[in-house]
Amino acid sequence: TLNSVLNSNAIKNLPPPLGGAAGHPGSAVSAAPGILYPGGNKYQTIDNYQPYPCAEDEECGTDEYCASPTRGGDAGVQICLACRKRRKRCMRHAMCCPGNYCKNGICVSSDQNHFRGEIEETITESFGNDHSTLDGYSRRTTLSSKMYHTKGQEGSVCLRSSDCASGLCCARHFWSKICKPVLKEGQVCTKHRRKGSHGLEIFQRCYCGEGLSCRIQKDHHQASNSSRLHTCQRH
């Protein structure tokens, strides 16, 4: 829907295992074994979750920020934590999930104060590799469908990712949303660095698949901030 349409991930109500309990992406980390841990794009148990150490937000996935896992904890030990949903407490923009920013200590929608239909969008960066087609999938065209799927197939009309079949997410293509494939390891993903930048895409990529998160490609670490390539990588 519209708020999430403008987010790069455009993910609502993810079906497990790609998403956790709806409405709780910012749950606190628990040290108890077997408790659900909201890491990256997948809820995992503490037993098999490997916290990703970080020094800055840019090193974390699209839906994460870099912070100490315990309140008032050792500032030297920081890991990637799940972003905070709208109306949750925050201290800086990066803590808020895509499409939101930190205002007066609360995550609020980035697009509350302007008409979201204005043509102010910029086309998502496109890279010269075989994963960089604007919509991220092949060009086959089927103009008629008599199949009545409960879950939408690739290219189907959707409002949220739960409308799409397994392995697909609901993401924006121009001014509407369709089911697109979840990104695989090595595929280019979108990492947002600017406040409000989540709303600037007319071709949204899906999020990275299970066990992957969107991180700077190792050989691009030396590149300038603006051109660093992000790809889906194993945790």
Epitope: L2, N13, R116, S145, L159, W175, S176, I178
Partner: antibody, heavy 117, light 107 residues
Framework: QVQLVQSGAEVKKPGASVKVSCKAS????????MHWVRQAPGQGLEWMGG????????SYNQKFKGRVTLTVDKSSSTAYMELSRLRSDDTAVYYC??????????WGQGTLVTVSS | DIQLTQSPSSLSASVGDRVTITCITS??????MNWYRQKPGKVPKLLIS???TLRPGVPSRFSGSGSGTDFTLTISSLQPEDVATYYC?????????FGQGTKLEIK
Amino acid sequence: QVQLVQSGAEVKKPGASVKVSCKASGYTFTENTMHWVRQAPGQGLEWMGGINPHKGGTSYNQKFKGRVTLTVDKSSSTAYMELSRLRSDDTAVYYCARDWLGAMDYWGQGTLVTVSS
Amino acid sequence: DIQLTQSPSSLSASVGDRVTITCITSTDIDDDMNWYRQKPGKVPKLLISEGNTLRPGVPSRFSGSGSGTDFTLTISSLQPEDVATYYCLQSDNLPYTFGQGTKLEIK
């Protein structure tokens, strides 16, 4: 400016099919999903389904149980809605409506389909 | 499917009155609510889109509020041209669903 022009009124017998067209202009047809909404006389609005012209992907309201088929012809920027096995309670005005970020912002003028024996 | 309960089903008010129409959804839809006005014999017109956003060209006397399950369309000062049926539409989850409509008349 954006315009959606629909085909004219139709009178059909129960059990027949009807195909309504919606010709779009004033914007790039493949960039927006096209929805179909119907309104029975004196009644409210009911979403039937939508089609995204980019790949022809569709989504339907399950209420219509396979009776509705949405198609597009990209070369003429035209969307079509075919409703089969018509019943008397399918008598309604059928609208096409352009999707804009989740809302339906521009609507066709409507096509009255009357089902009568 | 998400059910939308719109109230009142009809109302009569005087020019200049403040009018409110409510729409309650069967599940939390965040702020994914849209409001339409349909004048007699005319096509529905989008007034307010998701996030309580006033559409371009729509008079500022119209406003939308609410999130979660409770939503309100307010007309701050009723005008004669506002005689119409008003519909809410949720765009949070397929299938799209509309409220049953509120018929607004001038006293």
